[in-house]
Interface confidence: low
């Protein structure tokens, strides 16, 4: 991978005045031991509101790669395989926590950051505004 | 809130031997400033694959509250408002990062953990297995 030069202004890991800091062990514990990876891998294609996955990469963030869903159509796929514009494909969004290197390029100093990601799409009935 | 007693075995924040640790500033930076939280708040009800949201709480985890989606039906809602069992409501799952207090009850020591959450549901065409 790319070696990012260390920022000379990085705070000392032992600095007691570093604001609201905690120690975090990056050896990730995975609680998802009994999941079947194949089960949900093709929903993006089989959904009535199908989506594409786009790679979002940022070396200053951990995790550095996040996959973002983008709905393929404004409408939803009907039983005939055509797009029905009486329904809407919409992204399901979730706020997630990531770690952002702060100051930039520091190997051992991060700040928690909340970002909004689109995980997939769902088909909804549109809200129709009637004009009086 | 509940005051959790400090575990006497908590590692020292300055311990250089604490495995693969980094300093993390818990002042969360929120990048979602221009998003409208209400926009997607009712998708769970308007979707053809509607879902309920269940509160999952764990004081040893950060964030301590996570909302889990559970699909309401096996099938999907058709144009008449009935459940169509020729289609399937399925959960869209995502792996997210959380912080787990480790050792338990330590105020300044965490471990990164991956957990799988269901964010919402989508309607998919079922996979039909034909028996020869």
């Amino acid at each position: 991978g790319i070696t990012i030069p260390r920022n000379p202004g990085c705070p000392n890991s032992e600095d007691k005045n570093f604001p609201r800091t905690v120690m975090v062990n990056l050896n990730i514990h995975n609680r998802n031991t009994n999941t079947n990876p194949k089960r949900s891998s093709d929903y993006y294609n089989r959904s009535t509101s199908p989506w594409n996955l786009h790679r979002n990469e940022d070396p200053e963030r951990y995790p550095s790669v996040i996959w973002e869903a983008k709905c393929r159509h404004l409408g939803c796929i009907n039983a005939d395989g055509n797009v029905d514009y009486h329904m809407n494909s919409v992204p399901i969004q979730q706020e997630i926590l990531v770690l952002r290197r702060e100051p930039p390029h520091c190997p051992n100093s991060f700040r928690l950051e909340k970002i909004l990601v689109s995980v997939g799409c769902t088909c909804v009935t549109p809200i129709v505004h009637h004009v009086a | 809130g509940i005051t959790i007693p400090r575990n006497p075995g908590c590692p020292n924040s300055e311990d250089k031997n604490f495995p693969r640790t980094v300093m993390v500033n818990l002042n969360i930076h929120n990048r979602n400033t221009n998003t409208n939280p209400k926009r997607s708040s009712d998708y769970y009800n308007r979707s053809t694959s509607p879902w309920n949201l269940h509160r999952n709480e764990d004081p040893e985890r950060y964030p301590s509250v996570i909302w889990e989606a559970k699909c309401r039906h096996l099938g999907c809602i058709n144009a008449d408002g009935n459940v169509d069992y020729h289609m399937n409501s399925v959960p869209i799952q995502q792996e997210i990062l959380v912080l787990r207090r480790e050792p338990p009850h330590c105020p300044n020591s965490f471990r990164l953990e991956k957990i799988l959450v269901s964010v919402g549901c989508t309607c998919v065409t079922p996979i039909v297995h034909h028996v020869a």
Epitope: T35, S41, V65, W67 | E95, L116
Partner: nanobody
């Protein structure tokens, strides 16, 4: 740190063959199912093939069945994809991925290797 490094991509004529490799490190390779996933230019992510931990079971997307073969060498911490009878629609960036739920939220992907099938 989990690392996955793909290699073996390149330009090939329709009907030709390529063998992709993925060198894995930073985790117990033999404990995980492994995947090849691809992304064609301007298109979405497509799961291509899966191989179980001991190599005993393989799964393929319909469009590559009979043409692609996934294999692994646990002693070398390596994953392979033998691609035969290549078609223009196989043009994509190919990524190897550690056995997690798709879409992957974690960066357990390599940078990918580009396969271009063109005359």
């Amino acid at each position: 740190e989990v690392q996955l490094v793909e290699s073996g991509g390149g330009l090939v004529l329709p009907g030709g063959s390529l063998r992709l490799s993925c060198a894995a490190s930073g985790f117990t390779f033999s404990s995980y199912s492994m995947y090849w996933v691809r992304q064609a230019p301007g298109k979405g992510l497509e799961w291509v093939a899966e191989i179980k931990q001991d190599g005993s079971e393989q799964y393929y997307v319909d469009s590559v069945k009979g043409r692609f073969t996934i294999s692994r060498d646990n002693a070398k911490n390596s994953l392979y994809l033998q691609m035969n009878s290549l078609r223009a629609e196989d043009t994509a960036v190919y990524y190897c991925a550690k056995g997690e739920i798709l879409p992957l939220y974690f960066d357990y992907w390599g940078q990918g290797t580009l396969v271009t099938v063109s005359s």
